[in-house]
């Protein structure tokens, strides 16, 4: 069951996922001059069985030089940020290998992709927060959010996070700070 | 709470156009994809089209492309169906559904009647 | 495209159980695990009732359930009760990245 709403929005923070659960969509984005190719896939699914999950159909962009219809080229990263999106992760980024069953872990960058990547979650999905470059965490609780379903209606659970402006970066749970990440941005992903 | 909203039956003549319209409302309207779905009176269900409001790009079935224009105005989650010359035979009931995981459409509108007689 | 077969009506009595099959080809319902199923009350839209071949969304009963072999789909109705009777359609995601609809099956519920 998809989650309705966004995850809750913190005052100077970010959250994103560790592992993404089954049912998951990643909406296949293309950057500004670029769009799906006409046959290609719509959106990325985290699907599988109980011993293994990956995401299903590739993103693919091309130019929209090549479009011959009058239809409009993918809007500019900074309309994309509107919900359920997250940071693309670097293509360098070493991913750690360890299982987390039942979900996907970050699907790789594909060519010619958005900055912004818009995620559909469902619910079980738990995202994670932290304090953005210059900002650090005070009074800190759970720094973590759940879909949840109520009463046939989904909800995200509120994380107890305040981050305070002192140019000091926190980390996601159980993260020493990267030393070559000047966005503060995890090391390594829980994979599946 | 999520829904998408259809706007109200239309009585048309042949050769009049038509601009028909499904707002997405309780959901991040821009970031899913609307398809069209047409029934004719007492027949089943024919998948026309799809659009994502986020940059518009637009799919068609083979059997409705050139015959119809979906469109959308993300600044108001709002998809369209047009048509720009009605004939008889465009007389149906058109649903929008949201395209949501596994590829289903999860949620539908209510649909719109559409009657073009003479 | 051509429409997903469907056959046309079945029935059955109340308790019993029916199974409704929908027959694509390897481009349609044979390429993917996308194969959908919806029920079409008298006058109402469509409700989506299985997706993924097999899962149902929350709310469905589990007296519903999905199968798939080859490039057939099949919906089958546990228990059926009197509110059961409707239209079925099946629908399945191509691969030229479009949808394809079955051509419905009408169930009555006997007596």
């Known amino acids: 069951e998809l989650c309705d709403d966004d995850p809750p929005e913190i005052p100077h923070a970010t959250f994103k996922a560790m592992a993404y659960k089954e049912g998951t969509m990643l909406n296949c984005e293309c950057k500004r001059g670029f769009r799906r190719i006409k046959s290609g896939s719509l959106y990325m699914l985290c699907t599988g069985n109980s011993s293994h999950s990956s995401w299903d159909n590739q993103c693919q962009c091309t130019s929209s030089a090549t479009r011959n219809t009058t239809k409009q080229v993918t809007p500019q990263p900074e309309e994309q940020k509107e919900r359920k999106t997250t940071e693309m992760q670097s293509p360098m980024q070493p991913v750690d290998q360890a299982s987390l069953p039942g979900h996907c872990r970050e699907p790789p960058p594909w060519e010619n992709e958005a900055t912004e990547r818009i995620y559909h979650f469902v619910v079980g999905q738990m995202v994670y927060y932290q304090c953005v470059q210059g900002y650090r965490a005070l009074h800190r609780g759970p720094a973590e959010s759940v879909c949840k379903m109520t009463h046939g209606k989904t909800r995200w659970t509120q994380p107890q996070l305040i981050c305070t402006g002192e140019m000091e970066t926190s980390q996601f749970p159980g993260e020493e700070k990267p030393q070559a990440s000047p966005e503060g941005r995890p090391e390594s992903e829980t994979s599946c | 709470q999520v829904q998408l909203v259809q706007s109200g039956a239309e009585v048309k003549k042949p050769g009049e156009s038509l601009k028909i319209s499904c707002k997405g409302s309780?959901?991040?309207?821009?970031?899913?994809?609307i398809g069209w779905v047409r029934q004719m009176p007492g027949k089943g269900l024919e998948w026309m089209g799809i659009?994502?409001?986020?940059?518009?790009?637009?799919r068609y079935s083979p059997s409705f492309q050139g015959q119809v224009t979906i469109s959308a105005d993300k600044s108001i989650s709002t998809a369209y169906l047009q048509w720009s010359s009605l004939k008889a035979s465009d007389t149906a009931m058109y649903y929008c559904?949201?395209?949501?995981?596994?590829?289903?459409?999860?949620?539908w509108g209510r649909g719109t009647m559409v009657t073009v007689s003479s | 495209q051509s429409a997903l077969t469907q056959p046309a009506s079945v029935s059955a009595s109340p308790g019993q159980s029916i199974t409704i099959s929908c027959t694509g080809t390897?481009?349609?319902?044979?390429?993917?695990?996308?194969v959908s199923w919806y029920q079409q009350l008298s006058g109402k839209p469509p409700k989506l009732i299985l997706y993924?071949?097999?899962k149902r969304p929350s709310g469905i009963s589990d007296r519903f359930s999905g199968s798939k072999s080859g490039n057939t789909a099949s919906l089958t109705i546990s228990g059926l009760q009197a509110d059961d009777e409707a239209d079925y359609y099946c629908?399945?995601?191509?691969?030229?990245?479009?949808?394809?609809f079955g051509g419905g099956t009408q169930l009555t519920v006997l007596g």
């Open positions: 559904a949201r395209l949501g995981s596994a590829y289903a459409f999860d949620i």
């Open positions: 309780g959901y991040s309207s821009t970031s899913y994809w």
């Open positions: 659009i994502y409001p986020g940059d518009s790009d637009t």
């Open positions: 390897s481009s349609d319902v044979g390429a993917y695990i996308y």
């Open positions: 993924d071949v097999s």
């Open positions: 629908s399945s995601y191509t691969r030229s990245s479009t949808w394809v």
